[in-house]
């Protein structure tokens, strides 16, 4: 049976899928589709890679990891309840019946009502350099923005607030990291 993954409405959903390239840069085609993996293909394709690059994608669907190293995990931006369902990751390894196929179940929950709905915007505006994301390029991370002048009290207060917030869950679930100091 498929593995289940969860996200809230308005969040980004993350569906993991990996393979190990035979050699660096020796990529195999991969497709992501909505619906369970059929016998040969990917269902309703939302993203596809070839031996070199992402060659097809639809809005809101992207690869946040380094697909050149075999991380072909799918990120779905700003999910709605309609995004719930089965997704197919198919690694189209050349040869006779070598495909690896994975069915992943995405469950979207209604958004929780939080007392501090502006926290995420405020935090990223004040501390843009604290967010690092996995990138497409050879570098493992991309640093966003530059560090503004802040004091330790601000950092401490915001870090405590962040620990219990939905943002902390968002960041942890999406694979982003928070660096303080």
């Amino acid at each position: 049976s498929e593995v289940e993954y969860r996200a809230e409405v308005g969040q980004n959903a993350y569906l993991p899928c990996f393979y190990t390239p035979a050699a660096p840069g020796n990529l195999v085609p991969v497709c992501w589709g909505k619906g369970a993996c059929p016998v040969f293909e990917c269902g309703n394709v939302v993203l596809r890679t070839d031996e070199r690059d992402v060659n097809y994608w639809t809005s809101r669907y992207w690869l946040n990891g380094d697909f050149r190293k075999g991380d072909v995990s799918l990120t779905i931006e700003n999910v709605t309840l309609a995004d719930s369902g089965i997704y197919c990751c198919r690694i189209q390894i050349p040869g006779i019946m070598n495909d690896e196929k994975f069915n992943l179940k995405l469950v979207i929950k209604p958004a929780k009502v939080t007392p501090a709905p502006t926290l995420q915007r405020d935090f990223t505006a004040a501390f843009p350099r604290m967010l690092t994301t996995r990138g497409h390029g050879p570098a493992e991370t991309q640093t966003l923005g530059s560090l503004p002048d802040i004091n330790l009290t601000q950092i401490s207060t915001l870090a405590n607030e962040l620990r219990d917030s939905r943002l902390a869950n968002d960041l942890r679930d999406s694979g982003a990291t928070i660096r303080i100091g």
Epitope: V30, C31, G35, A36, E41, V45, R90, Q92
Partner: antibody, heavy 119, light 111 residues
Framework: EVQLVESGGGLVQPGGSLRLSCAAS????????MSWVRQAPGKGLEWVAA???????YYPDSVKGRFTISRDNAKNTLYLQMNSLRAEDTAVYYC?????????????WGQGTLVTVSS | EIVMTQSPATLSVSPGERATLSCRAS??????????MQWYQQKPGQAPRLLIY???NVESGIPARFSGSGSGTEFTLTISSLQSEDFAVYYC?????????FGGGTKVEIK
Amino acid sequence: EVQLVESGGGLVQPGGSLRLSCAASGFTFSRYAMSWVRQAPGKGLEWVAAISSGGSLYYPDSVKGRFTISRDNAKNTLYLQMNSLRAEDTAVYYCARGREADGGYFDYWGQGTLVTVSS
Amino acid sequence: EIVMTQSPATLSVSPGERATLSCRASESVEYYGTSLMQWYQQKPGQAPRLLIYAASNVESGIPARFSGSGSGTEFTLTISSLQSEDFAVYYCQQSLKVPLTFGGGTKVEIK
């Protein structure tokens, strides 16, 4: 208009080889899984080989190791290389397009090409 | 492999009558709530033509008198009122597993 046109059939001796071609037009060939399906005279349909859009290959045991399916997306052409042919391989060979997003069933077929294996 | 068995081998029907063709799979062809079963029509000297996919979905351009039903291992193709152009051989096919397999066919002939 989707068109699939097979060629390359003919008479061949047992143990011989033949290469079938299927020229595709009217659709984005590279996006589709493609198959070969055969039909012996007076008999039913038998799936022979498939190649996915990503190039993965599939065969039934009856032809595995003897037949090779391949595709040239630049030429919009599907191929079937048949080696070590046997009398029981005598059939009309159809090129068939797998349904988009699935590939496991066939929404367009060629007219077929006859392969006769006989001494 | 999944073995597909069609019955009857030959069905004699008068024009205007209803025809019911059966197909049984040796194991279930259900997959995430969908029956991966198709039906094709083949006339002499012609390539097969897709009629029904996923057990009950009528292919574009196919007359409404053709319908499919069933789930699991038992499937039916129904032609509600046979027209002269419907006399042909009909095949079922499963697309759950490799090897893809077809039934032996049912010949629908004029009574």
